[in-house]
Amino acid sequence: EVEKTACPSGKKAREIDESLIFYKKWELEACVDAALLATQMDRVNAIPFTYEQLDVLKHKLDELYPQGYPESVIQHLGYLFLKMSPEDIRKWNVTSLETLKALLEVNKGHEMSPQVATLIDRFVKGRGQLDKDTLDTLTAFYPGYLCSLSPEELSSVPPSSIWAVRPQDLDTCDPRQLDVLYPKARLAFQNMNGSEYFVKIQSFLGGAPTEDLKALSQQNVSMDLATFMKLRTDAVLPLTVAEVQKLLGPHVEGLKAEERHRPVRDWILRQRQDDLDTLGLGLQGGIPNGYLVLDLSMQEALS
């Protein structure tokens, strides 16, 4: 807490300007009117205040707005935003995308801080859903943002927002998240033609079921191994050798380099060795010729 002291004669601030950098902490406290500060917040960023001086300015705003800052002030906080705690931010009501962008810009190039996470949470909850413009903005600043959301939170993403998602935004998503995002992407891109559709849907295929992979195999898509390796194992296992060959096209020879990794390894174990041999890649581990394959899960379902 800064002690309350009278402002020295002639030092009362008429506006927020460079002269204030020479004020001691107690002088800032005594001589800068909080209401003046609030109306001229946009000037603070251009002045090289010390961290201690910024603490005083924050304290003045806290006193003026104990229930939380208005958006007109929040939008111009600039580097003062870095002084805010998650508790401070929880009092705010941020509705403008411009305000959100302005504050994210301050934190640009850094990991997502607890303050930023709280700000985003407040903003998204205020909007009710992750609309396209918001998603566009958030993934531009934090490519991994989408994958930091729980499957429950992702369910509030409308299919129209999927257009804003870039492949790198999904890099750190796990299968549970892709399970939620894939049906939305399928819906969003449903009116595109074959090759364009595949380019857009490719990053989401980690959530695709077997029947969709079978359908893709009929469309000459030439899926690369990076995409194939992200597919759900349970979706890959029922695919035949012919279907995988069609799905991968010229990339099929890459199966050899990945034959000991999931899901390729598990898929190989389910194929007849005869069928694997037709690929001419030397893949080993298939079901030997003459062996009968019993699907025990099907037997249990019938009994």
Partner: antibody
Framework: EVQLQQSGPELVKPGTSVKILCKAS????????MDWVKQRHGQSLEWIGD????????IYNQKFEGKAILTVDKSSSTAYMELRSLTSEDTAVYYC????????????WGQGTTLTVSS | QIVLTQSPAIMSASPGEKVTMTCSVN?????IYWYQQKPGSSPRLLIH???NLASGVPVRFSGSGSGTSYSLTISRMEAEDAATYYC?????????FGGGTKLEIK
């Protein structure tokens, strides 16, 4: 520009463990397996194993089974190799190397981490 | 496991001279890859899929071969080519490297 930055040299005692890291930058981490290769002084290269960052699926050269443990942290694009029960035979330079999924070669290599096991 | 035997183990060449080194495999493989390593540095990919030049590699390097016999050729030796060269296979598990050919400048 693609870079694989490895942790610095290690001098450790026999019987202990060590964890070497390899931080990738400049490309999509999940489009590549991270492989590890051993090279003893004046000798050839030995493939240890690799890990797929999407599934955490690992494969090891049988010779290094139980000796090396490979892990990844996708969020920081970092691969790790832990070497256990160290002996003087483990004294070597260890490289991480990037292998594009579906390809059989290593297109980028880390600068190497020198491990010295000595009492 | 597949064994790759490189020969010669050590060789020297004068600047401008043509250099050829071989990599023999005990079992047939689909592709061979070649790496160059200079003292104190990491290996660098030179040739992938037997004959394809890696990005940034000078065109004086070339690779050829099939089955069990492969070779790396430098059409005109330069001082900066002095290094150890390794072949590698990925056709059979575990993935193996040859013992290396050390190329010195005369």
């Amino acid at each position: 520009e693609v870079q694989l930055q490895q942790s610095g040299p290690e001098l450790v005692k026999p019987g202990t463990s060590v964890k070497i890291l390899c931080k990738a930058s400049g490309d999509t981490f999940t489009a590549y397996n991270m492989d590890w290769v051993k090279q003893r002084h004046g000798q050839s290269l030995e493939w240890i194993g690799d890990i797929n960052p999407n599934t955490d699926s690992t494969i090891y050269n049988q010779k290094f089974e139980g000796k090396a443990i490979l892990t990844v942290d996708k969020s920081s694009s970092t691969a790790y190799m832990e070497l256990r029960s160290l002996t003087s035979e483990d004294t070597a330079v260890y490289y991480c190397a990037r292998r594009k999924l579906g390809r059989g070669y290593f297109d980028y290599w880390g600068q190497g981490t020198t491990l010295t096991v000595s009492s | 496991q597949i064994v790759l035997t490189q020969s010669p183990a050590i060789m020297s060449a004068s600047p401008g001279e043509k250099v050829t080194m071989t990599c023999s495999v005990n079992l047939s493989v689909r592709y061979i890859y070649w790496y160059q390593q200079k003292p104190g540095s990491s290996p660098r990919l030179l040739i992938h899929d037997t004959s394809n030049l890696a990005s940034g590699v000078p065109v004086r390097f070339s690779g050829s071969g099939s089955g069990t016999s492969y070779s790396l050729t430098i059409s005109r030796m330069e001082a900066e080519d002095a290094a150890t060269y390794y072949c590698q296979q990925w056709s059979s598990f575990p993935y193996t490297f040859g013992g290396g050919t050390k190329l010195e400048i005369k």
